[in-house]
Interface confidence: low
């Protein structure tokens, strides 16, 4: 689409006569008719295939035609066309005398023609005017002409449509040849594709406007290069979305099972020593004077039997006091006033003199102890039972009564609740402090994986266009990580309009 423009500049008719030679009365009131048509080797009458235009009366006899384009007038004359400019044309310009105000052809006498010129040739699209002058016996016409493209049309033939825009459908201006020139921040054939924030991850990020970086499901961070770990992942990290790789000292599906409970929680009180013994499991070895699973319970000082040689212990506000039997003295009744002559050794113990008879020592038979063999051996005094087991004296020996979940001579072994394979359908068993937990394979659920449920959400390959599928174990659904150029919950849509809500 374009416009053939004809600028009339000067018409000379000095004698003021018509083509027939007859003079105009009182002078030749001159207007012009223009016919633009396809190229003809010999310009002949017929349809003005490219268009026609007429002027009002522009002057009398000889006159100059002023440029009226700036004021919205009719010079240059406009002959618009809505086809590809062929590069060649034929042009007929007729000058007519208007005796009255009616300029219609049928209203004019046949001999009102003043002059007629016809030219033909090649004409390229361009801004430059071609100046021409045509002279006949009685008249002379000076004019110039050119072909320019209409707004939004470009190229050698005005055949290339280009309209600058800055909306959903493109962000560009037009070059002189009609090619698109993208606005800053946009790219692609139609400048529809935003250039994302520099460094925005090619696969994991996308944008709907320039310098933006929006993350696909499973990714986060300014450049969408940080994966989001599995929902509920407590002490773990990921290298791909929805993973949960446990930090040192943590285990379990969600890295929430403490394998280093002692360090993380310091459960043992009153200076006790802590030992890890499995997931969320630990043992506290208490300092003298304390007891309980966490050594939280302070013993009465007399409970540790500090008084020797049959002395009796009394609690006092500031500690304890030993009441010694006859023949003994000292803070713990540890000193004797007796000798072997006094037969101080009980329960068959044999007496040995010491320090030239000033003191003695008893050698006790099995199962008896004490400086006078007065005490039956309590094989439980050393707290041999681990994991909170209860020590029981059984004659010459001892035994440990273990808490649930422990076994062994000293309750030192953790009973595996998993030993009896309680998890159905190939579930994986995990020992916990208060029982067990089954991690079920895809398609099964329930405390023991006994319930058949939906299969792995990704098994049906729900993602299109070579997208990567991730199973969200917490919701039993899938998430598709789309390759560049696709969107949608299954990556089924090619990128078209930018989403209206770029979260």
């Amino acid at each position: 689409s374009g416009v053939f423009q004809l600028q009339l500049q000067e018409f000379i008719n000095e004698r003021g006569v018509l083509a027939s030679g007859r003079p105009c009365e009182p002078g030749c009131r001159t207007f012009f008719r223009v016919c633009l048509k396809h190229f003809q080797a010999v310009v002949s009458p017929g349809p003005c295939t490219f268009g026609t235009v007429s002027t009002p009366v522009l002057g009398t006899n000889s006159f100059a035609v002023r440029d009226d384009s700036s004021g919205g007038g009719r010079n240059p004359l406009q002959l618009p066309f809505n086809f590809t400019w062929p590069g060649t044309f034929s042009l007929i310009i007729e000058a007519w005398h208007a005796p009255g105000d009616d300029l219609r052809p049928e209203a004019l006498p046949p001999d009102a023609l003043i002059s007629k010129i016809a030219i033909q040739g090649s004409l390229a699209v361009g801004q430059n005017w071609l100046l021409d002058e045509q002279t006949s016996t009685l008249t002379r016409l000076r004019y110039s002409y050119r072909v320019i493209c209409s707004d939004n049309y470009y190229g050698d033939n005005c055949s290339r449509l280009c309209k600058k825009r800055n909306d959903h459908f493109g962000h560009y201006v037009c070059q002189p040849d009609g090619n698109l020139s993208c606005l800053p921040g946009w790219t692609g054939e139609y400048c529809q594709q935003p250039i994302c924030l520099s460094g925005c991850h090619e696969q994991n990020g996308y944008c709907s406007k320039p310098a933006e970086c929006l993350c696909r499901p499973g990714w986060q961070g300014r450049l969408c290069n940080e994966c989001i770990p599995h929902n509920g992942c407590r002490h773990g990290t990921c290298s791909t979305p929805w993973q949960c790789t446990c930090d040192e000292g943590w285990g379990g599906l969600f890295c929430d099972q403490d394998l280093n409970y002692c360090t993380h929680h310091s459960p043992c009180k009153n200076g006790a020593t802590c030992s890890n013994s499995g997931q969320r499991s630990y043992t506290c070895t208490c300092r003298p004077g304390y007891t309980g699973v966490d050594c939280e319970l302070e013993l009465s000082e007399c409970d540790s039997n500090p008084c020797r040689n049959g002395g009796s212990c009394k609690d006092q506000e500031d500690g304890y006091h030993c009441l010694c039997p006859p023949g003994y003295y000292g803070l713990h009744c540890e000193h004797s006033t007796l000798s072997c002559a006094d037969s101080p050794c009980f329960n068959g113990g044999s007496c040995r003199e010491r320090n030239q008879g000033a003191n003695y020592a008893c050698e006790c038979p099995p199962n008896f102890t004490g400086s006078n063999c007065e005490k039956k051996v309590d094989r439980c005094t050393s707290n041999p039972c681990a994991n909170g087991g209860q020590c029981l004296n059984r004659g010459p020996s001892r035994m440990c009564r273990c808490r649930p979940g422990f076994t062994g001579t000293y309750c030192e072994l953790h009973v595996s609740d998993c030993a009896r394979n309680p998890c159905a359908h190939g579930g994986t068993c995990h020992d916990l402090e208060n029982g067990l937990m089954c991690t079920c394979p895809a398609g099964f659920s329930g405390r023991r994986c006994e319930v058949r449920t939906s299969i792995d959400a990704c098994a049906s390959s729900p993602c299109f266009n070579r997208a990567t599928c991730y199973t969200d174990l917490s919701t039993d659904t899938f998430v598709c990580n789309c390759p560049y150029g696709f969107v949608g919950s299954r990556c089924e849509f090619p990128v078209g309009l930018p989403p209206s809500f770029p979260w």
Epitope: L214, C215, R216, P217, Q220, G221, E226, I228, P229, N231, G232, C233, R234, T475, V487, G488, S489, F493, P499, S500, F501, W503
Partner: antibody, heavy 120, light 108 residues
């Protein structure tokens, strides 16, 4: 299992500021994978989304309430909060807090809701 | 903002019957970002469907969602006594997030 619990005064005077807190248990509020939203329901009516906050502190508000609204997050206390200023009787509603997965703003987890009445 | 219109306002049916609830959007909901919720008196809404057709965890398969663009449907294939409640649709493809006015499913 993630649980959300709203707390705050049940009665607010007109022109004052309504303040509510949502405490999250059984899950990390500091995970980048979620948006934490407030939603309200006028008595006997439908639901209206108020706005959300991300653990990074980013917020997005309903334009109809934006000029009066502030939502913040305190990851150390595992809480996020709502402040709505210059309240009128039209703000009387049950206020819910809820969790949405990042990029997909449907609400899989909700608090039980708390009724706030605006009256003098 | 996208306005969601639910119809009918009330649906009176008997247990065992099929319920079809409609949600129409004032403009296209991008990527079928539409969810359905169930709400019983005195309780918070409960997520049933997201992404127009994906069932949430623990939701029975008698609940199904369909549709795209501006027309969406929630179907309850066979009503159980516990299904009588108010149902809301919600779009999350455009800001602000908006909910429909609700459809009450009551016992006939």
């Amino acid at each position: 299992q993630v649980q959300l619990q709203e707390s705050g005064p049940g009665l607010v005077k007109p022109s004052q500021t309504l303040s509510l807190t949502c405490t999250v248990s059984g899950g990390s509020i500091g995970s980048g994978g979620y948006y934490w939203s407030w939603i309200r329901q006028h008595p006997g009516k439908g639901l209206e989304w108020i706005g959300y906050v991300h653990y990074s502190g980013n917020t997005h508000y309903n334009p109809s309430l934006k000029s009066r609204l502030s939502i913040s997050i305190d990851t150390s206390k595992i809480q996020f909060s709502l402040k709505l200023s210059s309240v009128t009787a039209a703000d009387t509603a049950v206020y819910y807090c809820a969790r949405a997965p990042r990029g997909y703003h449907y609400f899989a987890y909700w608090g039980q809701g708390t009724l706030v009445t605006v009256s003098s | 903002e996208i306005v969601l219109t639910q119809s009918p306002g009330t649906l009176s049916l008997s247990p065992g019957e099929r319920a079809t609830l409609s949600c129409r959007a004032s403009q296209s909901v991008s990527s079928s970002y539409l969810a359905w919720y169930q709400q019983k008196p005195g309780q918070a809404p409960r997520l049933l469907i997201f992404g127009a057709s994906s069932r949430a965890t623990g939701i029975p398969d008698r609940f199904s969602g369909s549709g795209s663009g501006t027309d969406f449907t929630l179907t309850i294939s066979r009503l159980e006594p516990e299904d009588f409640a108010v149902y809301y649709c919600q779009q999350y493809g455009s800001s602000p997030l908006t909910f429909g006015g609700g459809t009450k499913v009551e016992i006939k």
